[in-house]
């Protein structure tokens, strides 16, 4: 007795594709060793097709896949365009040779059922339309014409010519002939169930002279298409259902035992699991729509479905298109955090992971938005301008080859409590969702600025200070110029090494940031923030204004962020006659809803790229003292 | 409702033959999969054969004990499932129970791939 399991009989049709799953016991080993599928020959040899190592043989090539569940003790091989040479005796197993564990497999692949010659053979997807043509001649033109289905010897009436309708088919199935054609009558059948299936007859005329056609309808169930997703990636469900139901509503539901529970529909309607993490755009005027779910869970593994109807509902006899999706727990995609946390006044830093591969692909953030299908407009990018509202407060850090970027958000009030998504130009599989949750602050921030009301005047020396306890102590401390293109560092060194000190004085921690001489281009936010090499804390920032000598009081941007603080005699500055290069990359808001959208917008960054880059200084020079 | 109603059981001879079959009313869409399981008195509910429909391709299981003895068939629209058996031993008395999914996936062996069971039918194998 073999510990592989499968199906013994698999049978299938001509042009059909079969997806063969393979059970084997639950170690270590077996997860790991290869897996082969592989053709029995009459001389006892068993010929390897396709295996988890990579080979594929020639007559498979293009049209199979294995692929290896470890979570699940399955692997299952996907094979495509069937034909009738398919057929035969193969072993689906486990090691390094085919000699291994295995279980035998009998694959059967028939020809389309023929009929006989005057049958006609419609094949459609359930929820469609069938048109049956009955021919007659030109003798029963004015004879009744009418539609049956066979059911065993009797035929029952379908529809007719005196505008006799089944009720089954009330509302479903009409009569006409088409302009001046003599010949034809036409049957349409719309809304099609599965148990429509079968052998109909038309007629025209009555007894031995009476015209007869015969239709085979066969009405078919979706086939899944298999989808094979990696833990904390994303999918994409790209659904048609052609013009018929363009102005109906669409909906994704998720098979869930009998029923197919609504995920997302275009009247509003979300399943709470998904929130934040679902977008449903239309694609254009024929009824095409897709639906991106971010942040794939064990859970989301199952089967879909998209559909249209009035009601934004499943309904039978409605078009479907069906998909199975597979959630491989062996990711490619490090585990980040899900939720972070702020308090209004602070500020959070956000690391996104990205394909460590595609460290020169453009990064983006976006906030998602509930509306009725969930968008994610962008507010910052490598080369996006960050979206009115953020200015002074949001910037986007890079790290090339690191496989992570770092988004700064501060000034943090309740309204920033919501969904975000990390997301880049490049592999599309790579999406991060991120739940902000920003709650009152209940003390001082750790970061305070002083003075509060910044106005340098040109010319002059202008020094502005930061204050930070002593849990800060080890870590670097900056003080960056934000610009629409990131917050360059101002450059800055150290004189002397730090004396290591057993104790901290939470009085005297204080890093400054001089401005000599003041120029006008010096006004602006600047960020004092900390770090650990690539790693970015806290951040606080201020508005400084500047002014000439003779004006009056200036306008002031204050936040409250910023809170004063006392001066203190031990401090890191850094002086600055700071020199900005703004090269601004132009980047309208989009709604990343898939691959394309995305590309999209990354190719029209790709012309604006600036050659700044968030976190370089080039321009600027300083000292500290 | 969902009724899954299974017919066919009686008592036999060893050697003999039989035919069960099952017919499912008020599933809600086409089974995607149907299965035979059994149970004899003081044993648990054990796995027999199963079919599963996708698309156009049909799948059929056997249990290693069955294998070449019985032979499972069905239709998918009619929701209707069949079990042939054939050279039918002593050890395969026990109640037999029809069971169906709406959904094909889970393995096919355990009980949990299963949402729907009929009341059952009792096969006896006198020797």
């Known amino acids: 007795q073999s510990p592989i399991f499968g199906p013994q009989d698999v049978s299938s049709i001509e042009g059909n594709s079969v997806s063969i799953t393979c059970y084997y016991p639950d170690t270590s080993v077996n997860r790991h060793t290869r897996k082969y599928w592989c053709r029995q020959g009459a001389n006892g040899y068993c010929a390897t097709l396709i295996s988890s190592n990579g080979y594929l043989s020639k007559e498979y090539s293009g049209r199979a896949s294995l692929i290896n569940f470890p979570e699940n003790s399955t692997f299952v091989i996907n094979i495509a365009h069937l034909t009738q040479e398919d057929t035969g005796s193969y072993k689906c197993g486990l090691g390094t040779t085919n000699r291994g564990l295995f279980f035998d497999v009998s694959l059967e692949v028939s020809q389309v059922p023929e009929f006989p010659n005057d049958t006609h053979v419609y094949t459609k997807d359930i929820g469609r339309t069938v048109t049956i043509e009955c021919r007659f001649k030109e003798g029963n033109a004015h004879s009744k014409k009418s539609l049956c289905k066979k059911r065993g010897e009797a035929c029952e009436v379908v529809i007719d010519s005196t505008e006799y309708v089944d009720p089954s088919y009330k509302d479903r199935a009409i009569l006409f002939m088409k302009g001046t054609s003599r010949d034809i009558f036409y049957v349409n059948i719309s809304h099609l169930i599965p148990s429509d299936a079968g052998l109909y007859v038309c007629q025209a005329g009555e007894g031995p002279s009476a015209d007869k056609n015969n239709a085979d309808l066969q009405v078919l169930e979706p086939e899944p298409e298999l989808l094979y997703k990696d833990l904390r990636s994303s999918v994409t469900f790209e659904c048609d259902l052609g013009r018929e139901v363009a102005n109906d509503a669409k909906y994704l539901c998720r098979k869930n035992k009998e029923t197919c529970d609504v995920i997302i529909n275009t009247l509003g309607k979300r399943d709470p699991a998904f929130e934040g993490r679902i977008l449903l755009t239309p694609r254009d005027d024929n009824g095409r729509f897709s639906v991106l779910i971010t942040g794939l869970r064990k859970e989301d593994a199952g089967h879909y479905q998209c559909g249209a109807h009035s009601s934004g509902l499943p309904q039978e006899g409605w078009p479907v298109q069906a998909w199975q999706l597979f959630v491989n727990e062996e990711s490619t995609i490090p585990n980040s955090r899900s939720v972070v946390k702020g308090v209004t006044g602070g500020s959070v830093a956000i690391v996104c992971p990205y394909n460590p591969k595609e460290s020169s692909s453009l990064k983006y953030w976006c906030h998602w938005e509930a509306d009725e299908n969930g968008r994610c407009p962008v507010l910052v990018g490598t080369q996006a301008l960050v979206q009115e509202g953020y200015e002074g407060r949001l910037a986007l850090f890079d790290q090339p080859g690191s496989g992570a970027y770092t988004v700064i958000l501060n000034q943090l009030t309740t309204q920033d409590s919501g969904f975000y998504w990390c997301l880049t130009d490049g592999d599309s599989r790579w999406r991060t969702t991120i739940e902000l949750q920003v709650a009152e602050a209940t003390k001082k921030p750790d970061l305070e600025v002083t003075p509060q009301n910044a106005t340098a005047v040109i010319g002059e020396t202008f020094t502005i200070s930061c204050h930070y306890p002593c849990k800060f102590y080890s870590q670097e401390k900056y003080w960056c110029k934000w610009s629409n293109d990131g917050c360059h560092i101002l450059p800055s060194h150290d004189e002397g090494a730090r004396q290591s000190s057993v104790s901290c004085d939470q009085s005297s921690q204080i890093v400054s940031m001089t401005l000599n001489p003041v120029k006008k281009e010096d006004e602006g936010w600047y960020w004092c923030g900390v770090k650990e090499g690539q790693v970015y804390g806290e951040t606080t920032a201020i508005y400084v204004a500047v002014e000439e000598r003779t004006r009056g009081s200036p306008h002031i941007n204050p936040t409250d962020a910023n809170a004063r603080a006392k001066d203190a005699p031990e401090e890191e500055a850094m002086e600055s006659s700071v020199r900005e290069d703004e090269n601004k990359a132009n980047l309208d808001p989009r709604l990343f809803a898939d691959e394309r959208e995305i590309q999209n917008a990354g190719d029209q960054a790709q012309e604006n790229r600036a050659s700044g880059n968030a976190g370089s200084a080039g321009g600027q020079s300083g000292s500290s003292k | 409702e969902v009724q899954l109603v299974e017919s066919g059981g009686g008592v036999v001879q060893a050697e003999d033959s039989l035919r069960l079959s099952c017919a499912a009313s008020?599933?809600?869409?086409?089974?995607?999969?149907m299965g035979w399981f059994r149970q004899a008195p003081g044993k648990e509910r054990e796995f027999v054969a199963a079919?599963?429909?996708?698309?156009?391709?049909?799948?059929?299981y056997y249990a290693d004990s069955v294998k070449g003895r019985f032979t499972v068939s069905g239709d998918n629209a009619k929701k209707t499932l069949d079990l042939q058996m054939k050279d039918l031993k002593p050890e395969d008395t026990a109640v037999y129970y029809c069971?169906?999914?709406?959904?094909?996936?889970?393995?096919?062996?355990?009980?949990?791939?299963?949402?729907?069971w009929g009341q059952g039918t009792q096969v006896t194998v006198s020797s």
């Open positions: 069971a169906a999914h709406p959904d094909y996936y889970g393995d096919p062996r355990t009980s949990g791939a299963y949402r729907y």
């Open positions: 008020g599933l809600p869409f086409s089974s995607s999969r």
């Open positions: 079919i599963g429909w996708s698309g156009r391709s049909t799948y059929k």
